[in-house]
């Protein structure tokens, strides 16, 4: 049969609120070298146990025998530290260990969740959570809205789930755990109500350097909104915002709009360019969640200058002229040009010469016509810039150069004239 | 000297339930977990739970929660394992094992084999 | 859980010669436990506390090791050495085993 248990005092009980300190002791009387007094929970070695070993000889000699006393100190009380508790020691070749000393917790419910501050939409429903354990158990939980119960009894309402239909004013929410020890309260969390996200943003009409936007507000409560944010931001080849990336890739273009109305005229924008815009709008409590992002394009428009430096040179019948693509912006795709010439005493000649930028004439006649002059515009998709000023041809001087070009005869049907009054760019004439 | 035996080998059909013995001699029954640790064959070991004889409690290993129930009768110093709801990868040698941190005395094992 | 990977899987050597089994845990750990397993047979403790022979192992068994390195030497391979060696811990639940070294004879 086994030895006798070297223990002559065993761990005893410790019950108490979480946080409390307290000592677990356990002592025994060998003969000889005192041996290490290890310490198990639940059957487990406490490897980092705050234990301190005190060794007393109870003689002169070293094989007299020792009094030898571990004590556990438990210096904040939590659930983990709950258990059977025992002192293990090995002597020779012999286990042993004590009898079980006892951690109990038993106080006041202790929160492990608790609402938290959150910001809801108008009208949204949402849900806020709570959950509190003893011992001693049960447990039971009573919701608070604006320090007003939600329930008639602990117990009786929603428990660790509260779920809320939906508000429209910022309000305080907490819960109460009770036991049979007592109540403890919760944090109060504060819910603030902002407006819902505005709706159907949406292009009123496009120029090509402006957009106009509309959208619809949503819901704010008994807040009213003070304004509204639009952002746009110019697309990068679709691809972050596309991705739904929530942040634009570069700073975006940000303008206010007083409401109502809920309108916008947003100015200083590229022409025959892709933005993405966006909205949000704000009350007293905070500013709504933002829309998705809208892509948006403006359109084209017409070249806002007349091409640059024409130069026109005549030799007889013939007439060379060459030009520049307009310094001033195109406000769109280049399409081509379009050519106006014009005699003293002759009907206007229009020629669409597409995108080159010199062209010879063939005149009609032998060249007797007097005061020609050319004038030159460009065009895009959404029409025709402004003409340049009337360039006149130069006879050609023996010793300059004469580039051969593609002859581009004088139309002898009248298809190619347009009448005077459609020429509404060609004052000039 | 510590000694544990167990009962002998189980052939079981898939669904019913088994119930090991291990019977301690040689030291304190109360005073010493015991745990329950399983060889599938060819395989390593998996422990199961322990019981602690003093007071009855158990602590179970999760994946075996709600189909393993540990007993013991200190009259007659022995501890019990049944397991429920036997599958064919229930198969194994089950051991009942001294605990005093670590497992430093074994039974000598109980074949269970679950087949239809 | 915390898992621990024994290597190598398989020790070939022979009577006379040094084995060294490591053992590493997924995890850091304060003790190893070591056991050793023979066919058809329960296991049986070798070291306790990562370094402590258990009673009646001879002195040719050592065990060292901190954090998640530990190791099982033996010092001169005796002819009933060879057998599958496994490590454990309990640092935290559920206590859990190696997958086993087979040390065989070469």
């Known amino acids: 049969q086994a030895e006798e248990s070297p223990f002559v005092g065993n761990p005893g009980n410790i019950t108490g609120a979480r946080g409390l300190t307290g000592t677990l002791r356990c002592q025994l009387q060998v003969q000889g070298e005192p041996p290490e007094v290890h310490w198990l929970r639940d059957g487990q070695i406490l490897e980092l146990a705050d234990s301190t070993q005190t060794q007393v000889p109870l003689g002169e000699d070293e094989q007299d025998d020792w009094i030898v006393v571990s004590q556990l100190r438990i210096t904040s009380l939590q659930l983990s530290d709950t258990g059977q508790y025992q002192c293990l020691v090995f002597l020779g070749h012999q286990t042993f260990v004590s009898q079980p000393g006892y951690v109990g917790l038993e106080g006041l419910p202790y929160f492990l969740e608790e609402p938290e501050d959150r910001t809801v939409a108008a009208n949204t429903p949402f849900n806020l959570s709570c959950q509190a354990q003893g011992p001693p158990e049960p447990v039971d939980l009573l919701w608070l809205q604006d320090a007003v119960p939600l329930a008639t009894a602990p117990g009786h309402g929603p428990q660790r789930s509260l779920h809320v239909p939906g508000l429209n004013k910022t309000s305080s929410f907490s819960c109460e755990a009770h036991n049979a020890k007592g109540v403890t309260t919760s944090r109060t969390a504060t819910i603030t109500v902002l407006p819902q996200q505005p709706r159907n943003l949406h292009l009123v009409s496009r120029q090509p350097t402006e957009l106009e936007v509309a959208w619809t507000p949503g819901l704010s409560g008994i807040y009213p909104l003070t304004h509204c944010t639009l952002q746009a931001v110019l697309s990068d080849d679709g691809m972050g915002i596309q991705a739904g990336e929530p942040d634009p890739p570069e700073e975006p273009l940000t303008s206010q709009a007083s409401v109502p109305p809920h309108q916008l005229r947003l100015g200083s924008l590229h022409p025959h360019t892709p933005y993405h815009i966006r909205v949000a709008c704000t009350s007293s409590q905070g500013p709504s969640s933002w829309t998705h992002w809208l892509p948006v394009e403006t359109p084209e428009g017409v070249p806002l200058g007349p091409p640059e430096n024409i130069s026109a040179t005549r030799n007889g019948s013939q007439a060379f002229v060459h030009w520049q693509e307009p310094r001033a912006p195109l406000q769109g795709t280049l399409l081509g040009y379009r050519l106006a010439y014009q005699g003293q005493d002759t009907p206007e000649v229009l020629m669409d010469i597409g995108l080159r930028q010199e062209v010879t004439l063939e005149l009609q006649g032998d060249g007797s016509v007097s005061n020609l002059t050319v004038c030159v515009a460009a065009y895009t998709a959404a029409g025709d810039g402004p003409w340049s000023l009337p360039v006149p041809l130069e006879a050609w001087r023996p010793g300059q150069a004469q580039p051969v070009h593609q002859l581009v005869k004088e139309p002898s049907t009248p298809a190619f004239s347009w009448p005077h009054h459609h020429h509404h760019h060609h004052h000039h004439h | 000297q510590v000694q544990l035996v167990q009962s002998g080998a189980e052939v079981k059909k898939p669904g019913a339930s088994v119930k090991v013995s291990c019977k301690a001699s040689g030291y304190p029954f109360t005073d010493f977990y015991i745990n329950w640790v399983r060889q599938a064959p060819g395989q390593g070991l998996e422990w199961m739970g322990w019981i602690y004889p003093g007071s009855g409690n158990t602590k179970y290993n999760e994946k075996f929660k709600g189909r393993v129930t540990m007993t013991r009768d200190t009259s007659i110093s022995t501890a019990y394992m049944e397991l429920s709801r036997l599958r064919s990868d229930d198969t194994a040698v089950y051991y009942c094992?001294?605990?005093?941190?670590?497992?430093?005395?074994w039974g000598q094992g109980t074949l269970v084999t679950v087949s239809s | 859980e915390i898992v621990l990977t024994q290597s190598p899987a398989t020790l070939s050597l022979s009577p006379g010669e040094r084995a060294t089994l490591s053992c590493s845990a997924s995890?850091?750990?304060?003790?190893m436990y070591w056991y050793q397993q023979k066919p058809g047979q329960a296991p049986r403790l070798l070291i306790y506390?990562?370094?402590n022979l258990a009673s009646g192992i001879p002195a040719r068994f050592s065990g060292s090791g901190s954090g998640t390195d530990y190791t099982l030497t033996i010092s001169s391979l005796e002819p009933e050495d060879f057998a599958v060696y496994y490590c454990q811990q309990w640092s935290s639940n559920p206590p859990t085993f190696g997958q086993g070294t087979k040390l065989e004879i070469k």
């Open positions: 995890s850091s750990i304060g003790y």
């Open positions: 506390l990562t370094s």
């Open positions: 094992a001294r605990s005093t941190g670590f497992f430093d005395y």
